[in-house]
């Protein structure tokens, strides 16, 4: 997973005497916005699938009014980057379309008018994690300058963002069961270990050590059900103590969707479902035909030869909306069993299973001890997908093949000397100390200072100190 980022540096007239007239005037002030459409560069269906890798619409630029008699300068641009998140691997070779749109802010009936000022396209090779690449392209009398890059979202790394890696903890080798992240031999493959205690049913993680809750659950370990019955309004940030949703202002208040679009809340913001003939973040783009490529994510555009006739987008599997702009969250159905992490790859669902489980939906519970032998009389113990050997005295290691040195861990406290014995170890305590590990001081009058009850034992439980 990662993000493609596009930075527009300038949009203005190309050099030379034939500079275009400004797209804005005193009578018709306007502002610009940009649309980027990405697709895998070498896919055969690329032409028919305009935005299979994703698309993004910029914010509106500042309002610009032409100064009479002055040549068109570079036009004021929207702030920030255009970001296109990608869930799957970065393809390395990609195709792009960048469109410059003009929003006229005159006294049009029915809201602002839209027109496409310029469109540039190209195919490039780009490794994720690399530096910014800059491009300059002409479109008619206009010149567009932009930079782009692709970066991975941690813990994904590599030129395609397909490997989960972390820096090596030990200088010489990776931890048990972990392979080096070739070709980055100084990194190790990271096991996807959620925060300890994270609910396997209601929590999941996309990075080691985190615990993210499925809808309806809250708390640091996703063990607290969200109860809305005692709340004033089913909205707002969750209260950690009650698990109750505290009321707050809703992103759909006042309906930000124009042109009859309907608003629905999302975890971060809101989403507009636009009527046919409109698209954009707030359904503000209109007068669109199939020639404008309004269908995102590989949607097939039908009809709409002129601005007055509607078009229809036939969406590919995994996408919906009048412009195929919404990814169907098929993971919300929780298809992965036994705490597996659901990944919607667009073309397919994938379950990343927790250790000890397998199958397309993590439905198979693996027998960790099957075919595993513990040497030297050790017995196999199943545990969370990783078999473990409980070794007989005097042996250790993963399969009990190593002869254990019980004194290696220096178990005798307060200067006691350790002796290996057939039954384990024996501590010879220094003067003034006693106990199996020489852990208790002996009082000068000869009475021992044994605790009333060691931690974890109730008074009256059998206590063996020696």
């Amino acid at each position: 997973a990662g993000v493609f980022e596009l930075q527009i540096h300038s949009f203005g007239p190309g050099p030379g005497p034939g500079a275009p007239r400004s797209p804005c005037s005193a009578r018709l002030p306007c502002r610009l916005f940009f649309r980027v459409c990405l697709k895998p560069g070498l896919s055969e269906e690329a032409a028919e699938s305009p935005c299979a890798l994703g698309a993004a619409l910029s914010a509106r630029g500042p309002v610009y009014t032409e100064q009479p008699g002055a040549p068109a300068p570079d036009l004021p641009l929207p702030d920030g980057l255009l970001q296109v998140p990608f869930r799957d691997a970065w393809p390395g070779t990609f195709s792009f379309i960048i469109e410059t749109w003009r929003e006229e802010l005159g006294d049009q009936i029915g809201g602002p008018a839209w027109s496409l000022l310029a469109r540039v396209a190209g195919r490039r090779r780009l490794a994720a994690g690399g530096p910014w690449a800059r491009d300059i392209q002409r479109a008619g009398a206009w010149e567009l300058r932009f930079s782009y890059r692709a970066r991975c979202e941690p813990p994904a790394v590599g030129t395609a963002c397909t490997r989960l890696c972390r820096p090596r903890s030990a200088p010489s080798r990776c931890g048990p069961g972990l392979r080096p992240c070739a070709p980055l031999e100084d990194e190790c493959e990271a096991p996807l270990v959620c925060r300890a205690g994270c609910s396997p049913e209601h929590g999941f993680c996309e990075q080691p050590g985190e615990c993210r809750c499925l809808e309806g659950w809250t708390g640091p370990l996703c063990t607290v059900p969200v109860s809305t019955s005692s709340c004033l309004s089913p909205r707002g940030p969750s209260s950690a103590t009650t698990g109750c949703l505290v009321p707050g202002p809703g992103p759909c208040d006042g309906n930000p969707c124009a042109n009859g679009g309907s608003c629905s809340e999302t975890p971060r913001s809101f989403e507009c479902t636009c009527p046919r003939g409109f698209y954009g973040l707030r359904c503000e783009v209109s007068g669109v035909t199939c020639a404008d490529g309004p269908c995102f994510n590989g949607g097939l555009c039908v009809g709409g030869a002129d601005p007055d006739s509607a078009y229809i987008c036939h969406c590919p599997p995994g996408f919906q909306g009048s412009n195929c702009e919404k990814r169907v969250d098929r993971c919300s159905l929780q298809p992965c069993r036994n705490g597996g992490l659901c990944l919607d790859l667009g073309h397919a669902l994938r379950c990343r299973c927790r250790a000890g489980f397998a199958g397309p939906r993590c439905e198979h519970d693996l027998d960790d001890c099957a075919g595993r032998a513990c040497a030297n009389g050790g017995t196999c113990v199943e545990g969370g997908g990783a078999h473990r050997c409980s070794c007989a005295l005097g042996f250790g290691g993963r399969d009990c093949r190593e002869r254990a040195d019980p004194c290696a861990a220096r178990p005798c406290a307060h200067g006691g000397r350790c002796y290996a014995h057939f039954s384990g170890l024996v501590c010879a305590c220094a003067p003034g100390y006693m106990g199996a590990r020489c852990e208790f001081p002996v009082h000068p009058d000869g009475a021992s200072a044994l605790p009333a009850a060691p931690p974890g034992l109730r008074p009256g439980d059998p206590q063996r100190y020696l």
């Epitope: 050099p15 560069g41 032409a47 540039v120 396209a121 190209g122 195919r123 490039r124 090779r125 530096p131 910014w132 690449a133 800059r134 491009d135 300059i136 392209q137 002409r138 479109a139 008619g140 010149e143 300058r145 930079s147």
Partner: antibody, heavy 117, light 107 residues
Framework: EVQLQQSGPELEKPGASVKISCKAS????????MNWVKQSNGKSLEWIGN????????SYKQKFEGKATLTVDKSSSTAYMQLKSLTSEDSAVYYC??????????WGQGTTLTVSS | DIQMTQSPASLAASVGETVTITCRAS??????LAWYQQKQGKSPQLLIY???SLEDGVPSRFSGSGSGTQYSMKINSMQPEDTATYFC?????????FGAGTKLELK
């Protein structure tokens, strides 16, 4: 007036290296990429690669990777192309050309390289 | 790499005649095509970009058209100063690639 002034003709022996320069004037040097193009004995044109003087990033046609190295000196608004391990196949006219990816609007006058023992 | 096939390799035309040069790409290049003119002993000069946009200062008798993989450049009324070699160049994908050229002579 935009101008790209290239260095003079070069005669080199096989195995040697050569560095051709292209001095830009009349525009903001970091505002456009600098492309390099090879033309062998008056025949077709072949794109070698380009360099972005702003970020310093460069891109090459695969066959010229290891053969050509593109650099810039922003302080003097000059682009350079170094060709190494020269053979007779490298004998050609080399052009620098200002532009973006879909236009080369100004070209240098060309530098003739002759590789001969 | 995208291959550009240019035709004809050479042709001769009389003053006032209409000349058409064509260029075929090995795959769809989405209008990303430029045309250059190179006169004998000179550097190439940009005529047309984005398949049909005329560069500043280029006479209006030059025009470009086409889409997909097929593109052409037309000189509406041949003039003596149009004697040159013409190259097409695809700008859709890196590496940028040129056609082999068309040598246009005065008849």
């Amino acid at each position: 007036e935009v101008q790209l002034q290239q260095s003079g003709p070069e005669l080199e022996k096989p195995g040697a290296s050569v560095k051709i320069s292209c001095k830009a004037s009349g525009y903001s040097f970091t505002g456009y990429n600098m492309n390099w193009v090879k033309q062998s004995n008056g025949k077709s044109l072949e794109w070698i690669g380009n360099i972005d003087p702003y970020y310093g990033g460069s891109s090459y046609k695969q066959k010229f990777e290891g053969k050509a190295t593109l650099t810039v000196d922003k302080s003097s608004s000059t682009a350079y192309m170094q060709l190494k391990s020269l053979t007779s196949e490298d004998s050609a006219v080399y052009y620098c050309a200002r532009g973006g990816s879909n236009f080369f609007d100004y070209w240098g006058q060309g530098t003739t390289l002759t590789v001969s023992s | 790499d995208i291959q550009m096939t240019q035709s004809p390799a050479s042709l001769a035309a009389s003053v006032g005649e209409t000349v058409t040069i064509t260029c075929r790409a090995s795959e769809n290049i989405y209008y990303s095509l430029a045309w250059y003119q190179q006169k004998q002993g000179k550097s190439p000069q940009l005529l047309i970009y984005n398949a049909n946009s005329l560069e500043d200062g280029v006479p209006s008798r030059f025009s470009g058209s086409g889409s997909g993989t097929q593109y052409s450049m037309k000189i509406n009324s041949m003039q003596p100063e149009d004697t040159a070699t013409y190259f097409c160049k695809q700008t859709y994908d890196v590496p940028l690639t040129f056609g082999a050229g068309t040598k246009l002579e005065l008849k």
